[in-house]
């Protein structure tokens, strides 16, 4: 059993039929020793007196808020959450599997530049009852600071029968520079209370592996005089780190016919303009990814041909 | 072709061409490594990222752009230095050229180019002959140490008489791929930044 | 004590489907994730799916994939495996098994796919 | 077929000591705990260890288990007769959990 916040404590249970639990001792938070009672939840039963109360913590029936009383009025709350451990491993029963980029993933993080800031998220198909905290770290031995706001639903969606909440969070790291070379990941943790359940997630990765960039602003087709050929411009998007000369971005550009089946040709290039064929009822795409570290690409910015 | 972009001409700045054949050979090495060594901890998840320059140089700090500079966190060991030397440097005026960001980098280049040697002949004594560096790697490191053209005392290299441990250098061999990488893509930042000023 | 009983095994033609059963007694059903694993005969031990304690999530074998399904009936204790288009391959005793670090398994029913 | 390795076959002399490996890979034993089962002919599989080197009640302590980095060992002390039966390993796979893998099995002969 240990702390989590004030009043709040964790069982770690080895979570199998016919377990036999952990046997927890509560004390009463006061001066009084007589005339001490104890009760669980909303349940006016009284389970034992005593300065102390030991109980054995099996499952979801024996966590709860137990509330040590005199003479009808509570003294001190001791909220009792459960962590299953299944077979060695803690359950993941509140967050769904991202599966991307492999399986598992069940925090994905993302960062626009190189400035250490950075928006983690996850999925839940919970819908109350539900409280999340962060946390999050340059390195864990020695930990460097990173600072992480509050927790929002960001989306939600509906997937077959049930609808899927998305939460997300930002951070920043305390003192970023954005050209240095990371030797230690950051680490985030992430708290997942459902009910009196509690589990927790964490996520390492470097800031260059999460890069990726916003899509290109400013998408500009010129008619070439006398020619089927447009000029096409673009700029770096403002979201991307600075100088762009020392962070440079390469671009993928593409047309896309009317017919999603049409034969996409695409090229590569590290220019913020190119000259293409751009037939009507066509469309024009380019995309951004740095230049020199393979992270994602950004999503597309497109213009119509026409 | 729908599609066509204009071919830049011959850069201004002759380092940059090799930076990027530097960070291209960097990338190819560390993926070859990472599928021949796969029952091995090589991925960046599962190394330790040690950096055999620290402490030694100070590649990111002395090449800082302009622009981040201001940046306080960026300076934690920063050593200003705007004297100017070395055949990278031909003709150009710009404020960012340091001798010793250059210098930083050859110092690198030397002290990565020892390892990568050392650490060859040891795998070459490998009975498995399951991976060794190919010239590539250090052709294209000698190829840009010459450009940037300082001097320096040769550093020995090291060799030891005891049968290597293999699983360990070859786990060693990860890490040095993975740092390196890192430094390369530092260093065609670095280029790119100054091809443009 | 804890208890697993399956049924539903039997002679079956490949192509056909069966469905077999595990009726838990002795512990609280519904708070445990359940497997199912398979014996082929004189083979090894082969696991064929798992599905959560509330049945939210449902794991395939990739040989199983696409035509068995895994479901439960916590209120009335009973894990299921419906098995179509079944191949002679899929010839087996068929285990179901608690999760957990000390698990407990059924005495198996035996699924045999011949023409 | 399994990632779990295991010899197919090992014997020994009653009160002897025989050993079963199970080798696997950094992401399945390298990072999960190991079982271990007995199964004897036409009956259900019967847990011996879990989490790696732990007995459950009932288990003689003649059957230990341990694991070293992507492998684990069963070991048999003071081996008897009615320990002839198979014997397999299990883990998970980090990214396939909570898929089980099963070593590939292993037939403990008492000779004599």
């Known amino acids: 059993i240990w702390e989590l916040k004030k009043d709040v404590y964790v069982v770690e249970l080895d979570w199998y039929p016919d377990a036999p639990g952990e046997m927890v001792v509560l004390t009463c938070d006061t001066p009084e020793e007589d005339g001490i009672t104890w009760t669980l939840d909303q349940s006016g039963e009284v389970l034992g007196s005593g300065k102390t109360l030991t109980i054995q913590v099996k499952e979801f029936g024996d966590a709860g808020q137990y509330t040590c009383h005199k003479g009808g009025e509570a003294l001190s709350h001791s909220l009792l959450l459960l962590h299953k451990k299944e077979d060695g491993i803690w359950s993941t029963d509140v967050l769904k599997d991202q599966k991307e980029p492999k399986n598992k993933t069940f925090l994905r993080c993302e960062a626009k530049n190189y400035s250490g800031r950075f928006t983690c998220w996850w999925l839940t198909t919970i819908s109350t009852d539900l409280t999340f905290s962060v946390k999050s770290s340059r390195g864990s031995s020695n930990p460097q600071g990173v600072t992480c706001g509050a927790v929002t639903l960001s989306a939600e969606r509906v997937r077959g029968d049930n609808k899927e909440y998305e939460y997300s969070v930002e951070c920043q790291e305390d003192s970023a520079c954005p050209a240095a070379e990371e030797r230690l990941p950051i680490e985030v943790m992430v708290d997942a209370i459902h009910k009196l359940k509690y589990e927790n997630y964490t996520s390492s990765f470097f800031i260059r592996d999460i890069i990726k960039p916003d899509p290109p602003k400013n998408l500009q087709l010129k008619p070439l005089k006398n020619s089927r050929q447009v000029e096409v411009s673009w700029e770096y998007p403002d979201t991307w780190s600075t100088p762009h000369s020392y962070f440079s971005l390469t671009f993928c550009i593409q047309v896309q016919g009317k017919s999603k089946r049409e034969k996409k040709d695409r090229i590569f290039t590290d220019k913020t303009s190119a000259t293409v064929i751009c037939r009507k009822n066509a469309s024009f795409s380019v995309q951004a990814q740095d230049r020199y570290y393979s992270s994602s690409w950004s999503e597309w910015a497109s213009v119509p041909c026409s | 072709r729908n599609l066509s972009v204009a071919t830049p001409g011959p850069e201004m700045f002759p380092c940059l061409h090799h930076s990027q054949n530097l960070l291209k050979a960097a990338s190819n090495t560390l993926q070859k490594a990472r599928q021949i060594l796969e029952f091995y901890p090589c991925t960046s998840e599962e190394i330790d990222h040690e950096d055999i320059t620290k402490d030694k140089t100070s590649t990111v700090e002395a090449c800082l752009p302009l622009e981040l500079i201001k940046n306080e966190s960026c300076l934690n060991s920063r050593e200003t230095s705007f004297i100017t030397n070395g055949s990278c440097l031909a003709s150009r005026k710009t404020s960012f050229m340091m001798a010793l960001c250059l210098r930083s980098i050859y110092e690198d280049l030397k002290m990565y180019q020892v390892e990568f040697k050392t650490m060859n002949a040891k795998l070459l004594r490998d009975p498995k002959r399951q991976i060794f560096l190919d010239q590539n790697i250090l052709g294209v490191i000698d190829e840009l140490m010459q450009a940037l053209n300082f001097n320096s005392e040769t550093v020995p290299q090291k060799s030891s008489l005891e049968e290597p441990d293999f699983y360990k250098t070859k786990i060693k061999l990860c890490i040095l791929l993975h740092a390196f990488r890192i430094r390369a893509v530092t260093i065609d930042r670095v280029m790119s930044y100054l091809n443009a000023s | 004590q804890v208890q697993l009983v399956e049924s539903g095994g039997g002679v079956v033609q490949p192509g056909r489907s069966l469905r077999l059963s595990c009726a838990a007694s002795g512990f609280t059903f519904s708070s445990y994730g359940m497997h199912w694993v398979r014996q082929a005969p004189g083979k090894g031990l082969e696991w064929v799916a798992f599905i959560r304690y509330d049945g939210s999530n449902k794991y395939y074998a990739d040989s199983v994939k696409g035509r068995f399904t895994i479901s439960r009936d916590n209120s009335k204790n009973t894990l299921y495996l419906q098995m179509n288009s079944l191949r002679a391959e899929d010839t087996a005793v068929y285990y179901c098994k608690t999760h957990g670090s000390h698990d407990n398994w059924g005495q198996g029913t035996m699924v045999t796919v011949s023409s | 077929q399994s990632v779990l390795t295991q010899p197919p076959s090992v014997s020994g002399a009653p009160g002897q000591r025989v050993t079963i490996s199970c080798s696997g890979s950094r992401s399945n034993i390298g990072s999960n705990t190991v079982k271990w089962y007995q199964q004897l002919p036409g009956t259900a599989p019967k847990l011996l260890i879990y989490y790696n080197d732990q007995r459950p009640s009932g288990v003689p302590d003649r059957f230990s288990g341990s694991k070293s980095g992507t492998s684990a060992s069963l070991a048999i002390t003071g081996l008897q007769a009615e320990d002839e039966a198979d014997y397999y390993c299990?883990?998970?796979?980090?990214?396939?959990?909570?898929?089980?893998?099963f070593g590939t099995g292993t037939k403990v002969t008492v000779l004599g």
């Open positions: 299990q883990s998970y796979d980090r990214y396939t959990h909570p898929a089980l893998l």
